[in-house]
């Protein structure tokens, strides 16, 4: 059964110091979001019982395991049903507890019955405050049954309910006829699924035989111990003023458990915890009574003396229940109530026995579920006692259950039973998930679902390169951190698979399913540098840049150049996807703009270093373009443009730029500069015979203007071959600008 | 479908007898109280007599009380009122009906009515 | 024994609201239903001062305080033509006291 206990509060008469607590003694209970189990849930559930709206009560979780509900105003918040959810998947298991108001006009005799399928159930409910009016019987809410106020027997109203099945469970109340529901006795019946010492599907097997209270659940034949007690068979007594699965927890304040009404998973119910009695659970046990509510019996024999919470301690010589058994008979020794083992393996176990005469191998046995009798290997012969070791065949699920160690020796018997479980290593159901890539590391979140049992005690990442047959690596990780594969070679395909592990020998599963993950390009390394620019008008740059020279192919796909105005905080970025570029033509710039400018190589989606920055000052923008540029041919060297000056100028020009270049050229274009503003034809000189020249020209004032069209003109034939050209305008002839 | 059908009703004469029996059908007759009301000719509702689920509790409107029993069979699920010394003030439609408490409330209503049975004591 | 006093009849023109009274002595610390009875049919619950039964509209409401229990009523149609009856339980003896009764007309 899952390990969950709802606790009540009672001792505390002030609703506003009261509280309930559910505490969870699961691994990995109540940590919300996390992969391994699902939250705590405490609440009040007024489907059954409705009592008069309240502020909303305040839940306080303390730690994974335990959660605290308070905020109650007045005593009528705390009558009703509160409900207590915990485990995960197929354990989640809810707890219930039934609060009932100490000034009832009636009260549960007894709050929680636990009775067999088929039994007779009977609640009673004491008369508190008298009222002679019919008295109405509820089940879950709906009505049930009435009785006549003059059929109250010595006080009590009584339902008797015969033969009762599972679907009769449930929340019962007794109420007088037009009373408030404040005023009822609340009861809760639990209806196991089979008859008494029997559980599982057709209630064919046989229940361990719980002590000390303990109910056996009809489902997993596990016994639901009673506050105090653990062990399978609830054989074993928690010290005082603990309880939980494994004694583990602790009640709080300083008188122990007093006050506390502890709510463990169905088939128990509810009751106060070992030692206490009561409606309240502040009386302490009668002498010669111990155990939950006081319900159990000391009757101890050769001078054992009773102990409220644990029933009878034995003098020297003397064990057992009732300390009835002599020491000579031989006693199993420290058997552990509950082994975990994982499914295919060969555990060895070992069982320890005592008496006179001395127990020896040959006289302890160990006897599986299905009835097969195994017989140790070997014995440990100490002076106190003789340790047989066991070792067991390849474990199947069918050897989950109860295993029991027996000895014989002629002093007498003793068997101790214990659950073995079985677990089934756990089998990732999908492949890791990647988070992110780089060229040499892969981040990969491991947390999967899974087959099998946890709790997940490692996480084993294999992976290699894809389609490869080396072996493969290996890393292991916390389960629920992120995993980082380093040292991978950039651009390569990596199979990858989850290996999940649960706690002891042989608890690795089958590794998961593959997915494959790829690695980023490797980052580009060469740094480049900004070779010169030129501004090839108002809002036009013409870039160029040089890489250092590097044996070996280049890492790279392109170039980014990126242009920073930091007068707008705006950003330029032009991308160049050809690796082999070395300039680039920047259009639509802001003309006038001061631009911080650099140039990255970059592969795949990542740069390499920038080059150091340059500052570039584009001109303000010019004039408009000249007007109706014409080229007439003179000779086989020379060609005369002639041109209008352009139209509504800003200001006087100070000089006009022509740009020659041949027809289909690959080159550069040429810049000559026409400083006399005033003329409006030029001859362009030094040209080649029979070849087509393109042109065209632009104004400057503050900066460079328009281009004008672009005219085309052949220089005459049978010239030579001229040294390049040059210009000469109408007044004289001037030299060469480029 | 929950149903209550009565029967044996019919012409008596003054200080005759007469039994009413009414068949439940459709829920566990015997966790209801059950009672019979009757109406006169042209006059208003009458409460008669009430039973208890058990049948060992029985309460009676004092206008019957010492002339009418009032008694159940659980395990036929039917409901009777002898009637006894009948007079021409007996004379009336006679419903039985089922006694129900609401959820989340305490209090009692009739939630199911018979057709009813006609009673006539005339000489 | 309870005495609860009902007016004879109540006439409504369609669509306008009918308020129908009880009075008894204490009565607003009972529970007081109502039924509803056509002619030639068995009575049919149809109110009480804290609930309403499945399939009885909404325009059917009531309350109840001091000595008068009020049942309402509203946007009245032709079918709502019936005797209305309030009831109250006296546990005094298990007893179960009607009104007398109050014929409502849809004029």
């Known amino acids: 059964a899952v390990d969950l206990t709802l606790l009540a509060n009672l001792r505390l008469t002030d609703p506003q110091r009261f509280f309930l607590t559910c505490v969870s003694g699961e691994a990995g209970a109540g940590r919300g979001s996390d992969a391994w189990g699902p939250p705590l849930l405490l609440e009040k559930d007024d489907r059954i019982v409705r009592t008069p709206p309240g502020p909303p009560l305040r839940l306080a979780r303390n730690g994974s395991h335990q959660v605290t509900l308070r905020g109650f105003s007045k005593p009528s918040d705390l009558v009703g049903v509160f409900s207590c959810v915990g485990g995960a998947g197929a354990r989640r298991t809810r707890v219930i507890y039934v609060h009932n108001s100490p000034g009832a006009h009636l009260l549960p005799d007894k709050v929680t019955h636990t009775v067999n399928k088929g039994d007779t159930a009977v609640l009673s409910a004491r008369v508190h405050k008298e009222k002679q009016t019919d008295v109405i019987w509820k089940s879950n809410g709906s009505y049930f049954y009435t009785l006549d106020w003059h059929e109250a027997q010595d006080g009590r109203f009584l339902l008797q309910l015969p033969n009762v099945q599972p679907p009769s469970s449930g929340i019962y109340s007794a109420t007088y006829l037009e009373a408030s529901p404040l005023g009822s006795a609340f009861f809760r019946l639990i209806v196991r699924g089979c008859g008494a010492g029997r559980w599982g599907p057709g209630c064919t097997k046989e229940c361990p035989g719980c002590l000390h209270g303990g109910v056996c659940h009809d489902h997993d034949g596990e016994c639901v111990c009673p506050p105090g007690f653990t062990g399978t068979r609830c054989e074993q007594a928690c010290r005082e003023g603990r309880f939980g699965q494994s004694c583990q927890e602790q009640c709080p304040g300083i008188s122990g458990c007093r006050g506390l009404t502890f709510c463990l998973p169905d088939p128990y119910g509810c009751s106060c915890g070992s030692g206490w009695r009561g409606s309240q659970c502040q009386e302490a046990c009668a002498p010669g009574h111990f155990g939950a509510d006081c319900r159990l019996q000391c009757q101890c024999q050769n001078g054992g003396t009773c102990d409220r919470f644990s029933g009878c301690v034995c003098p020297s010589g003397w064990h057992g229940v009732h300390c009835e058994k002599s020491d000579r008979i031989p006693q199993i020794l420290n058997m552990a109530s509950e082994l975990e083992f994982n499914l295919e393996t060969m555990p060895r176990i070992n069982c320890a026995a005592a008496g006179n005469p001395f127990p020896v191998r040959g006289s302890i046995e160990l006897r599986k579920p299905d009835g097969t009798v195994l017989l140790s290997t070997k014995a440990i012969v100490e002076p106190e006692k003789t340790t047989a070791e066991f070792e067991v065949p390849r474990l199947v699920l069918a050897d989950s259950g109860f295993w029991e160690c027996r000895v014989s020796t002629s002093g007498g018997q003793d068997s101790r039973r214990f659950k073995v479980n079985v677990k089934v290593p756990p089998v990732p159901l999908a492949a890791p998930r990647l988070l992110t890539k780089q060229s040499r590391q892969l981040v990969v979140s491991p947390l999967v679902s899974f087959s099998g049992d946890g709790p997940i005690s490692t996480v084993r990442l294999h992976y290699r390169p894809q389609d490869s047959t080396m072996d493969w690596s290996t890393i292991v990780v916390d389960p629920s951190e992120n995993v980082t594969l380093m040292n991978l070679r950039p651009k390569t395909g990596y199979s990858v698979r989850v290996q999940l592990s649960r706690p002891g020998e042989g608890g690795e599963g089958a590794w998961g399913p593959p997915t494959l993950m790829t690695t980023d390009c490797p980052e580009p390394l060469l740094q480049p540098w900004l070779e010169g620019w030129h501004v090839e008008g108002t809002d036009r740059l013409r870039v160029s840049w040089s890489l250092p020279l590097v044996p070996g192919p280049l890492v790279g796909d392109g170039f980014l150049l990126r242009l920073w105005d930091g007068t707008r905080g705006q950003e330029r970025r032009e991308n160049v996807s050809s690796p082999q570029a070395r300039t680039a033509l920047l259009t639509g710039l802001t003309p006038g703009t001061h631009y911080q400018l650099d140039v990255q190589l970059y592969h795949c989606t990542l740069l390499g270093p920038a080059s150091p920055p340059a500052h570039v000052l584009l001109p303000p923008s010019g004039p408009p373009a000249p007007r109706h540029l014409h080229a007439q041919a003179l000779s086989d060297s020379e060609i005369q443009l002639t041109w209008k000056h352009p139209e509504a100028l800003p200001g006087p020009i100070s000089k006009y730029v022509v740009e020659v270049q041949v027809a289909g050229g690959a080159g550069d274009p040429l810049w000559i500069d026409v400083d006399r503003p005033e003329e409006t034809s030029t001859i362009i000189r030094g040209l080649n015979a029979s070849t087509r020249y393109l042109f065209r020209m632009r104004a400057s004032i503050q900066g460079l203007g328009d281009w004008s069209n672009t005219v085309e003109e052949s220089t005459l034939g049978n010239g030579l071959q001229a040294e390049g050209p040059v210009q000469e305008s109408r007044a004289a002839e001037e030299g060469l600008d480029q | 479908e929950v149903q209550l059908l009565e029967s044996g009703g019919g012409l008596v004469q003054p200080g005759g007898s007469l039994r009413l029996s009414c068949a439940a059908s459709g829920f566990t007759f015997s966790k209801y109280k059950m009672l019979w009301v009757r109406q006169a000719p042209g006059k208003g509702l009458e409460w008669v007599s009430v039973i208890y689920p058990s049948g060992g509790y029985t309460y009676y409107a004092d206008s019957v009380k010492g002339r009418f029993t009032i008694s159940r069979d659980n395990s036929k699920n039917t409901l009777y009122l002898q009637m006894n010394s009948l007079r021409a003030e007996d004379t009336a439609v006679y419903y039985c009906?089922?006694?129900?408490?609401?959820?989340?409330?305490?209090?009692?209503?009739?939630?199911?009515w018979g057709k009813g049975t006609t009673v006539t004591v005339s000489s | 024994q309870s005495v609860l006093t009902q007016p004879p009849s109540v006439s409504v023109a369609p669509g306008q609201t009918a308020t129908i009274t009880c009075g008894g002595n204490?009565?607003?610390?009972?529970?007081v239903h109502w039924y509803q009875q056509k002619p030639g049919q068995a009575p049919v619950f149809v109110y009480d001062d804290n609930d309403r039964p499945s399939g009885i509209p909404e325009r059917f409401s009531g309350s109840n305080s001091g000595n008068t229990a009020t049942m309402t009523i509203s946007r009245v149609e032709a079918g709502d033509e019936a005797d209305y009856y309030c009831q109250v339980w006296d546990p005094t003896g298990d007893q179960y006291v009607f009104g007398s009764g109050t014929k409502v007309t849809v004029l």
């Open positions: 204490n009565i607003g610390t009972k529970s």
């Open positions: 009906a089922r006694v129900v408490v609401p959820a989340f409330y305490y209090y009692y209503y009739m939630d199911v």
